[in-house]
Amino acid sequence: AAQPNNSLMLQTSKENHALASSSLCMDEKQITQNYSKVLAEVNTSWPVKMATNAVLCCPPIALRNLIIITWEIILRGQPSCTKAYKKETNETKETNCTDERITWVSRPDQNSDLQIRTVAITHDGYYRCIMVTPDGNFHRGYHLQVLVTPEVTLFQNRNRTAVCKAVAGKPAAHISWIPEGDCATKQEYWSNGTVTVKSTCHWEVHNVSTVTCHVSHLTGNKSLYIELLPVPGAKKSAKL
């Protein structure tokens, strides 16, 4: 049965329209030639930045060996969408597929890959390529996790107290401070799946004059600093 390799290969490139594009196609180790009738399913968790293009790949099997190629797409709150190509008749068929941004990369008889143009939060879900051969099926599944970069702000709201916010990130960002203070952190969950994290810190020690808020997120990290003034100071804002 097909077994996953330990190493994942993440390719990132720029397309002509300046939209970042990533493709996750991992090599698998075939450890036996005695194929079982239903071959092992390989699943990959894949974080993808919002507003990029994504390409999802099928197992590496030449068209001459195939009967049907099917992409099954399960998105939250929607009926399962299937895109199928039947080699014998050279026909493609779609069932319950409404998102026009999810398409075959090209003609399925030339390339079985699936592409998502301009990934949105709604593309969070499970994508599976099923390759039907005369001796069983090969599967490749992707748990697609759409990442949203939070907007980071840092400001002083009262004497020796600073507030750092990571607004509308997905998943939730993690906020830490240098130096550590007396902190309280709150999370606010939005209906679109994003989370706002708010960390409020107070420093009693008067020799602390500058504090740094460090925001860790899957899309990248960001640090902002502020001087603790007797009165509220200038507001700092930045994207990761």
Epitope: L24, P60, I61, A62, N65, T133, D135, F138
Partner: antibody, heavy 119, light 110 residues
Framework: QVQLVQSGAEVKKPGASVKVSCKAS????????MHWVRQAPGQGLEWMGY????????NYNEKFKGRVTMTRDTSTSTVYMELSSLRSEDTAVYYC????????????WGQGTLVTVSS | DIVLTQSPASLAVSPGQRATITCRAS??????????MHWYQQKPGQPPKLLIY???NLESGVPARFSGSGSGTDFTLTINPVEANDTANYYC????????FGQGTKVEIK
């Protein structure tokens, strides 16, 4: 285990035809594409074409089109490669090889059949 | 058709040393993140034997002394360390749609 057994050596005259057989065992015969490759004495490997026993699809190397025919007999799990209008340069060892699905690699080969074309 | 060019044509290596064979394709044999390039070993009077598939995957039962690398158009087969019974011809092959082999590299052990 998976095995491919080819027919014995042949000696043919120029202009004649030869039909080489490749009998498969140890797996579901109709499930895997079979390729034919030849190797002239002291030379490299040359792909001739393939047959898919599942649906009888064939695809031949342009070089051999019109001269080569690949067929299969599902009752005996055997594929055949027939080459016509033989010339001396067709003298070679002819191999059948089974294509495994994953990666389209050839993991199982026949032992080879020597075809000698001589007047 | 894709043309595969192997180099060198022949190679003499001492036991324990490294042998490197390269294969260059006239156009990319990689698609969907996979490189449909395989390496075979052929000893006199025997059919070829699969060593490496999809550029870098070791076929079951093949010693780890054999390794493959590369993508796109440039590929390498490495034998390290070489042993006496590695004397053979080595062929690269691509298998995406129409298939071709490299012309072969003869490896001799000194």
């Amino acid at each position: 285990q998976v095995q491919l057994v080819q027919s014995g050596a042949e000696v043919k005259k120029p202009g004649a035809s030869v039909k080489v057989s490749c009998k498969a065992s140890g797996y579901t015969f109709t499930s895997y594409v079979m390729h034919w490759v030849r190797q002239a004495p002291g030379q490299g490997l040359e792909w001739m074409g393939y047959i898919n026993p599942y649906n009888d699809d064939t695809n031949y190397n342009e070089k051999f089109k019109g001269r080569v025919t690949m067929t299969r007999d599902t009752s005996t799990s055997t594929v055949y490669m027939e080459l016509s209008s033989l010339r001396s340069e067709d003298t070679a060892v002819y191999y059948c090889a089974r294509e495994d699905y994953y990666g389209s690699r050839w993991g199982t080969w026949g032992q080879g059949t020597l075809v000698t074309v001589s007047s | 058709d894709i043309v595969l060019t192997q180099s060198p044509a022949s190679l003499a290596v001492s036991p324990g040393q490294r042998a490197t064979i390269t294969c260059r394709a006239s156009k990319s044999v990689s698609t969907s993140g996979y490189s449909y390039m395989h390496w075979y070993q052929q000893k006199p009077g025997q059919p070829p034997k699969l060593l490496i598939y999809l550029a870098s995957n070791l076929e079951s039962g093949v010693p780890a002394r054999f390794s493959g690398s590369g993508s796109g158009t440039d590929f390498t087969l490495t034998i390290n360390p070489v042993e006496a019974n590695d004397t053979a011809n080595y062929y690269c092959q691509h298998s995406r749609e129409l298939l071709t082999f490299g012309q072969g590299t003869k490896v001799e052990i000194k």
